[in-house]
Interface confidence: low
Amino acid sequence: FNISGCSTKKLLWTYSTRSEEEFVLFCDLPEPQKSHFCHRNRLSPKQVPEHLPFMGSNDLSDVQWYQQPSNGDPLEDIRKSYPHIIQDKCTLHFLTPGVNNSGSYICRPKMIKSPYDVACCVKMILEVKPQTNASCEYSASHKQDLLLGSTGSISCPSLSCQSDAQSPAVTWYKNGKLLSVERSNRIVVDEVYDYHQGTYVCDYTQSDTVSSWTVRAVVQVRTIVGDTKLKPDILDPVEDTLEVELGKPLTISCKARFGFERVFNPVIKWYIKDSDLEWEVSVPEAKSIKSTLKDEIIERNIILEKVTQRDLRRKFVCFVQNSIGNTTQSVQLKEKR
């Protein structure tokens, strides 16, 4: 299709070499058409304009993304050619930074239902540069933590070296939705709730004598709780004896709850005590079975191919540890009568 009629937008992504930073492009179709596609600015029935050129379906993924090769070759479908670029609804996610992401990206509705739709497209010219020493070396992180229940702020990485006074107007998005009230280089959060977690995008406009472009940065914000003051507790096994059948296989599960820690280094292991000897057992890897903001439940199993008479004289001990301390739970096997 002819892209000469597409509206054009220039964007700059200055990525930090420090973090595995992401980037996004929104399919900013001209108003009011985009309301039919991306739902970012839904119109109520009373607001529907007199004529709607686009009568596309309300399917959120109803746009198509292409990249325009620099050598003039035909447009390429993003999904087929670029595994590190993911289309999510009307947003294009770049999973890895790099100057090779520079180029022209075009989006348009998948369904062309009227002659007006042909010119309905946006061409985004993306320039990608690594952050240089000349640019702000200690900019805000692209990963930011907010402590639940406290106050906090989310800083725009590309502007965090500038004072609030000299900062240009900033447009913020959270999970692809415009935050219309936020205009400064940081969002102040009076009280942090878990819904403040998400992907934030900050945009501001820069210009020279020739043209203007949008500088964009993406911030992953996670809401966290304070580091636990407690050692982990063992949820299972609860009993210190377990009835078993000799000669049969046996799996004993150890489940432990670990409180949140900033640097999380949980230990969960099994060892066997036999009179004065004790040794650690090689068992399958631990796995996380439940993870919440406050804690994580981790499970690790010990597997006996068949229970022997000798096993009845041993104690099987689950040992769990975090930075605060450790907890153990021992199990003695008892033959089923």
Epitope: R18, Y138, A140
Partner: antibody, heavy 124, light 107 residues
Framework: QVQLQESGPGLVKPSETLSLTCTVS????????WSWIRQPPGKGLEWIGY???????NYNPSLKSRVTISVDTSKNQFSLKLSSVTAADTAVYYC??????????????????WGQGTTVTVSS | AIQLTQSPSSLSASVGDRVTITCRAS??????LAWYQQKPGKAPKLLIY???SLESGVPSRFSGSGSGTDFTLTISSLQPEDFATYYC?????????FGQGTRLEIK
């Protein structure tokens, strides 16, 4: 750009409390963890502890009974108090910012911005 | 606490030399290791994090490798400004610990 500046008395008497403040300029104290590290003369670095802007702390067990780190977000400052000092506490004390980085699918922290350090001597 | 042992404790080298410093952890720390450079009277400066990732603005002659318990910092071609003390640091578990340092002197 973010800069850190330690301040406090350079001389403290044995058994007294060492008090230092770190002022953060060029950026907000919010969203980050902030650490204190010390370096005795001619020796290596020792991590003392960190504080999150909300007040959550974690201390080195070797100093835990004597250390208190606090934060004042309104002044963009965080402070260190070390009680019952001895000559062994003579050192250059540094404050630093801990920045979260995404690393091989984990979330780690490194000290990317440091103050220039302040020398504290414990002597009568 | 996890102990980090650096070797050598000191070494002499000339401009243009290739230099390797090692850091051994007393237990496995995955890739949660950083390297810092410290010059006399100055604060440490972050060079490498996550064992092998180069900090922004650090010359590419510095590189790091390793995971688990054994790590190395390599300077491919020493420059006059590289003569300093180098520290490794683990941030895999509390307390955060540093190696004892390696002093790099001009031969």
């Amino acid at each position: 750009q973010v800069q850190l500046q330690e301040s406090g008395p350079g001389l403290v008497k044995p058994s007294e409390t060492l008090s230092l403040t770190c002022t953060v300029s060029g950026g907000s104290i919010n969203n980050y963890y902030w650490s204190w590290i010390r370096q005795p003369p001619g020796k290596g670095l020792e991590w003392i502890g960190y504080i999150f802007y909300s007040g959550t702390t974690n201390y080195n067990p070797s100093l835990k009974s004597r250390v208190t780190i606090s934060v004042d977000t309104s002044k963009n400052q965080f402070s260190l108090k070390l009680s019952s000092v001895t000559a062994a506490d003579t050192a250059v004390y540094y404050c630093a910012r801990d920045v979260g980085i995404a690393a091989r699918n984990s979330y780690y922290y490194v000290m990317d911005v440091w103050g220039q350090g302040t020398t504290v001597t414990v002597s009568s | 606490a996890i102990q980090l042992t650096q070797s050598p404790s000191s070494l002499s080298a000339s401009v243009g030399d290739r230099v390797t410093i090692t850091c051994r952890a007393s237990q496995g720390i995955s890739s949660a290791l950083a390297w810092y450079q410290q010059k006399p009277g100055k604060a440490p400066k972050l060079l490498i994090y996550d064992a092998s990732s180069l900090e922004s603005g650090v010359p590419s002659r510095f590189s790091g490798s390793g995971s688990g318990t054994d790590f190395t910092l390599t300077i491919s071609s020493l420059q006059p400004e590289d003569f300093a003390t180098y520290y490794c640091q683990q941030f895999n578990s509390y307390p955060i610990t540093f190696g004892q340092g390696t002093r790099l002197e001009i031969k």
